[in-house]
């Protein structure tokens, strides 16, 4: 018995498409073999139509496709424009024709319902507006022109020439008779509703003499479109609706257990909570289409989502709708990283977000996710440099560990940081990712002083402390510009005084400059990594200004004596929740040993080899 | 709301037929699967056959233990839907029950991608 399975007879009408579905155990062989669909002949052979290898044969050139859906065990056969000769002994299957997997599909194509002779048929999706057409001859032009609908064998006055309309069709009907001439009367119907499906009758005239005209109208509720999206990736849902709608208020919604819509997000300003930091209702065209971005997916976002038009902003029947059938793949190709990153007040985050591999030399960028109406997501850095004003300083976007993930720092936190943010790219849309940024109690491990004025030509030394946890992490120090963050030599000092409970291994990282110059303002930052991993960093902004008094200055690590312009940090050390930076899987072993030649515009800084970092305890 | 009323169950002989209907109450989409399962005390439900409406095109789909003897039809999208049961045999003794889902999706044999049941009916296959 063959495990493939599908429909074992399929009947339509000429004029029409079918989406055949076959099913087949999803192995990894089952997956990636070849799919078919052919016809039995006579001599029992099977000759292929299409395949999933791209085959077409040319009786169905232009009308038919296989797609394979390995994820969920499934190829999909669509044939459009049938015809009478299309039906047949088909099989659909895996491998070679002539091989076991395979199931029999019989297909029937008749010649549709027997209407009156002459009848035209209008096909259109519901909520959608149909014009039909009603002619006439001269002599009935200055007659009375109407439309009925045949129920059984009776016929329903809908609307005539003399302002009569059927309650059931007010406010959305109209008859139109042109000037002379033209011996042709229309009758549009707008906001189609399933219940208007059915035959049709034009009439102008009255006794023997009058005129007649049948028309078939064919409501139909949209098919979904079925989508099909990796865990923890993105969706956009395009929706055009029309002209006729476009200053109309537009939503997506969500059909529920009642089969009712619940609304996902409107342009009315409401929004599911369930999609909070992860929609974005992207503003519409002069056509009236609009688009709707889900990122970070879920498997509970699975279902059938419809979006549409009404003033109320959510679903009403007789209104234009789009439907789609959204399956998350678990099988996700998009690889786990956190979704909620925590910083403290101070501190820094690192955030890693996943791009398509594939796609390395994509630009990347990361956004502020803004709740107000619809959403949106100004960019706040991109790989290119572009960083927004007020996150000077304090944001870098870095390329680094590559392979399909790139690394966002963001320090100098505060409570106004906390919220969703989008790493994305402008390459596969679906690689679209949100983490939210928490912002917890606590203080920040890496202690630099506040901002610290150097002198023209002086020596100046920035210490950065950093606990004993942080003793087997590769310590940086770095200039910050908005095209990243330049890596500087810096110097091991031993043990540190700021954090006494830490003992020996406990220590500090310098930065000096010598000499310093102009080039030297700026901010710099000190962090610690693992391999291509990035941890915590500090920043410390250096002013330049003209020498007063001779002599180097030295910016000392919490002393008394400081200068009035640096602050005196706490010593208070606490780690901080926060995955993305402290995992130790995410790390790599191998050590990066620092660039140690000129930097900066000429300062110079040497390491000093004597204090090199010994082992100390662990990185947690 | 969609519900699901079967009717038609009974006690026949082997080799007997039955008519098995399905009436649907509340909104119902154009894309439309129904199907019909059954079930032995102790045992899983069992795919028995299933009807797709999409556009205006229909899919039949039926488990090969009743290939040749059961057919299942459906008068139109919002119509009744019947499982004609031919050469009944002693095997065929289960609740059968009616499912829907809208749209149609996942492998009609899997009972899970169904939304809506309904409450069984009894079918005794005498020898």
């Known amino acids: 018995k063959s495990p493939v399975f599908g429909p074992q007879e399929v009947s339509s009408v000429e004029g029409n498409s079918v989406s055949i579905k076959c099913y087949y155990p999803p192995t990894s062989v089952n997956r990636h073999t070849r799919k078919y669909w052919c016809r039995k002949g006579a001599s029992g052979r099977c000759i292929t139509l299409v395949s999933s290898e791209g085959y077409v044969s040319s009786n169905y050139a232009g009308r038919a496709n296989l797609t394979n859906f390995p994820e969920n065990g499934t190829f999909v056969v669509n044939i459009a424009q049938l015809s009478r000769d299309d039906s047949g002994h088909y099989k659909c299957g895996l491998g070679i024709n002539s091989r076991g997997l395979s199931f029999d599909v019989s297909l029937e194509v008749s010649q549709g319902p027997e209407l009156p002779n002459g009848t035209e048929v209008y096909t259109v999706d519901v909520g959608r507006t149909v014009t039909i057409k009603c002619p006439f001859k001269t002599e009935n032009a200055p007659k009375t022109k109407a439309l009925y609908k045949k129920i059984g064998q009776t016929s329903v006055l809908v609307i005539d020439s003399r302002n009569y309309v059927n309650p059931n069709y007010k406010d959305r009907i109209r008859l139109r008779i042109p000037g002379t001439g033209q011996l042709i009367f229309t009758v549009v119907i707008d906001r189609l509703r399933l219940s208007d499906h059915g035959l049709y009758l034009c009439q102008a005239g009255d006794g023997s003499n009058r005129d007649e005209k049948n028309a078939d109208l064919q409501v139909l509720e949209p098919e979904p479109e079925l989508v099909y999206e990796d865990l923890r990736g993105s969706v956009t849902f395009h929706c055009a609706l029309g002209l006729e709608v476009a200053n109309v208020a537009k939503f997506l919604c969500r059909v529920n257990s009642r089969e009712t819509c619940d609304v996902v997000i409107n342009t009315l300003g409401k929004r599911d909570s369930a999609f909070e930091g992860r929609i974005l209702l992207n503003p519409q065209d002069k056509d009236g289409s609009f688009s709707v971005v889900i990122t970070g997916l879920r498997k509970e976002d699975e279902g059938r989502y419809l979006c549409g038009a009404h003033s109320d902003g959510q679903l009403q029947e007789g209104w234009p709708i789009q439907a789609w059938q959204l399956f998350v793949n678990e099988e996700s190709t998009i690889p786990r990283s956190p979704t909620v990153v925590k910083g403290v007040a101070g501190g820094s985050v690192a955030v890693l977000c996943p791009y398509n591999p594939k796609e390395s030399q994509s630009l990347k960028y990361w956004c502020l996710w803004e709740g107000a109406q619809n959403g949106r997501c100004p960019l706040l850095v991109e790989s290119q440099g572009l960083v927004q004003e007020q996150y000077e300083g304090r944001l870098s976007l870095l390329q680094e560990p590559g392979n399909g993930t790139f690394t966002v720092i963001l320090n100098q936190l505060t409570t106004q940081d906390a919220g969703f943010y989008w790493c994305l790219t402008n390459g596969d849309t679906r690689w679209r990712t949100t983490v939210e940024i928490k912002i917890i109690e606590g203080e920040p491990n890496l202690k630099v002083p506040g901002n610290v004025t150097a002198v023209l030509g002086e020596t100046l030394n920035i210490p950065c402390h950093f606990p004993c946890k942080f003793s087997s992490y590769e310590k940086y120090w770095c200039k910050w510009s908005n095209t990243g963050c330049q890596t500087l030599p810096s110097q091991d000092e031993g043990p540190s005084e700021a954090f006494v409970n830490c003992d020996e291994n406990s220590r500090l990282v310098s930065l000096t400059l010598n000499p310093v110059t102009r080039a030297d303002e700026g901010w710099y930052w000190c962090g610690v990594k693992q391999g291509h991993f990035y941890g915590e960093t500090a920043a410390v902004y250096v002013a330049v200004e003209e020498k007063k008094v001779a002599g180097s200055r030295y910016v000392s690590p919490a002393k008394a004596d400081a200068a009035p312009d640096e602050k005196v940090l706490d010593s208070g050390v606490r780690e901080i929740e926060n995955k993305a930076i402290q995992d130790p899987r995410l790390f790599a072993e191998e050590k990066v040993v620092a660039d140690t030649g000129d930097q900066a515009g000429g300062s110079r800084a040497s390491v000093d080899s004597s204090s090199s970092e010994e082992q100390g305890g662990s990185s947690k | 709301e969609v519900q699901l009323v079967e009717s038609g169950g009974g006690l026949v002989q082997t080799g007997e037929s039955l008519r098995l209907s399905c009436a649907a109450s509340?909104?119902?989409?154009?894309?439309?699967?129904m199907a019909w399962f059954r079930q032995v005390p102790g045992k899983e439900r069992e795919f028995v056959a299933a009807?797709?409406?999409?556009?205006?095109?229909?899919?039949?789909y039926s488990a090969d233990s009743v290939k040749g003897r059961f057919t299942i039809s459906r008068t139109s999208p919002k119509g009744e839907t019947y499982l004609q049961m031919n050469g009944l045999k002693p095997e065929d003794t289960a609740v059968y029950y009616c499912a829907a889902v809208s749209p149609v999706v996942g492998d009609p044999r899997n009972s899970d991608t169904y939304n809506y049941w309904g409450q069984g009916t009894q079918v005794t296959v005498s020898s």
């Open positions: 509340g909104r119902a989409f154009s894309d439309l699967r």
């Open positions: 009807v797709e409406w999409r556009g205006s095109s229909r899919y039949y």
